[in-house]
């Protein structure tokens, strides 16, 4: 079955936007005016995952690019990366677990928990211009809350 997808942008709770930083990394920084066009547009796909009352499994691809956010172990630590895929086969309903995030939505604030590594979340730093990463703490210094803006397809 074709997977259902929506185009969107994400901003962290400090209103930092996400932009490309090199070919395989995202960073978060404040953008204004025309610079807003730099922010990445995600294709959020609704995929199969664990049954849960408050978690919706999604995959986050970069619109019109064959890149997906994925979670892998690097030096024994859960790590966020942009992974290149074969566009003929992606997105798909049954995404490999490393590509799946549990979208948790409370009062229009979103968290993205790694399905592969429970309690690890897509995170940004308080500081400007730092990489988007996978963080193992919630409610600390690092930011794990995002807002979503729909983008016309």
């Amino acid at each position: 079955a074709p997977v259902r997808s929506l185009n969107c942008t994400l901003r962290d709770s400090q209103q930092k936007s996400l932009v490309m930083s090199g070919p395989y990394e995202l960073k978060a920084l404040h953008l204004q005016g025309q610079d807003m066009e730099q922010q990445v547009v995600f294709s959020m796909s609704f995929v199969q995952g664990e049954e849960s009352n408050d978690k919706i499994p999604v995959a986050l691809g970069l619109k019109e690019k064959n890149l997906y956010l994925s979670c892998v172990l690097k030096d024994d630590k859960p790590t966020l990366q942009l992974e290149s895929v074969d566009p003929k086969n992606y997105p798909k309903k049954k995404m490999e677990k490393r590509f799946v995030f549990n979208k948790i939505e409370i009062n229009n604030k979103l968290e993205f928990e790694s399905a592969q590594f429970p309690n690890w979340y897509i995170s940004t730093s308080q500081a400007e211009n730092m990489p988007v990463f996978l963080g193992g703490t919630k409610g600390g210094q690092d930011i794990t809350d995002f807002t979503m803006q729909f983008v016309s397809s």
């Epitope: 079955a1 185009n7 609704f46 199969q48 049954e51 919706i56 939505e105 729909f150 016309s152």
Partner: antibody
Framework: QVQLVQSGAEVKKPGASVKVSCKVS????????IEWVRQAPGKGLEWIGE????????NYNEKFKGKATITADTSTDTAYMELSSLRSEDTAVYYC?????????????WGQGTLVTVSS | DIQMTQSPSSLSASVGDRVTITCKAS??????LSWFQQKPGKAPKSLIY???RLVDGVPSRFSGSASGTDYTLTISSLQPEDFATYYC?????????FGQGTKLEIK
């Protein structure tokens, strides 16, 4: 509370068009799909299509492509469905309903329905 | 298209009875299944979504379950207001498809 209020009943001649409206209140219009469903007299429910007003995404049942055109006006929180080239078999009650953008919650809220009668 | 085969098409029961209505999907629908109640001249009313989650305000006598591609709506103890027509809906794949309906009548 959430409300979906549809336009009133219509009587149309074969070959004419009709535009049914669905005005929503009580939630953020752009974050919910608006679904359109029809029910012919004495029959079951049939899905026509859906629109996500915040994005302009539209999905149709192939059966209704060319028959139904779904639009939305985010300035008035109103969705529309226009039916063209009406025939007697298009006589039905047309309902709008809603589902959250991530599809999780099902068709939770429904309009009261709009009866469209096609008769010469 | 995914076919939703609903059974029985009609059912006679008494107040206090336990009744079950089944929908069989022609393929996997990843638990994207809802149940609706409709009374004559009224819009459908949502009862259950994602197989077993009760819509706010729906009495706990209604429940849903799944086994493979078979989905069941159970009313544990029928009340007079429960006599109506019930529909299932799959919303996993386009076009979304409804079951043919089950008319629940008073015996």
């Amino acid at each position: 509370q959430v409300q979906l209020v549809q336009s009133g009943a219509e009587v149309k001649k074969p070959g004419a068009s009709v535009k049914v409206s669905c005005k929503v209140s009580g939630y953020t219009f752009s974050r919910y799909w608006i679904e359109w469903v029809r029910q012919a007299p004495g029959k079951g429910l049939e899905w026509i299509g859906e629109i996500l007003p915040g994005q302009g995404n539209i999905n149709y049942n192939e059966k209704f492509k060319g028959k139904a055109t779904i639009t939305a006006d985010t300035s008035t929180d109103t969705a529309y469905m226009e039916l063209s080239s009406l025939r007697s078999e298009d006589t039905a009650v047309y309902y709008c309903s809603t589902i959250y953008y991530d599809y999780d919650q099902g068709f939770t809220y429904w309009g009261q329905g709009t009866l469209v009668t096609v008769s010469s | 298209d995914i076919q939703m085969t609903q059974s029985p098409s009609s059912l006679s029961a008494s107040v206090g009875d336990r009744v079950t209505i089944t929908c069989k999907a022609s393929q996997d629908i990843d638990r994207y299944l809802s149940w609706f109640q409709q009374k004559p001249g009224k819009a459908p009313k949502s009862l259950i979504y994602r197989v077993k989650r009760l819509v706010d305000g729906v009495p706990s006598r209604f429940s849903g379950s799944a086994s493979g591609t078979d989905y069941t709506l159970t009313i544990s103890s029928l009340q007079p207001e429960d006599f109506a027509t019930y529909y299932c809906l799959q919303y996993d794949e386009f076009p979304y498809t409804f079951g043919q309906g089950t008319k629940l009548e008073i015996k």
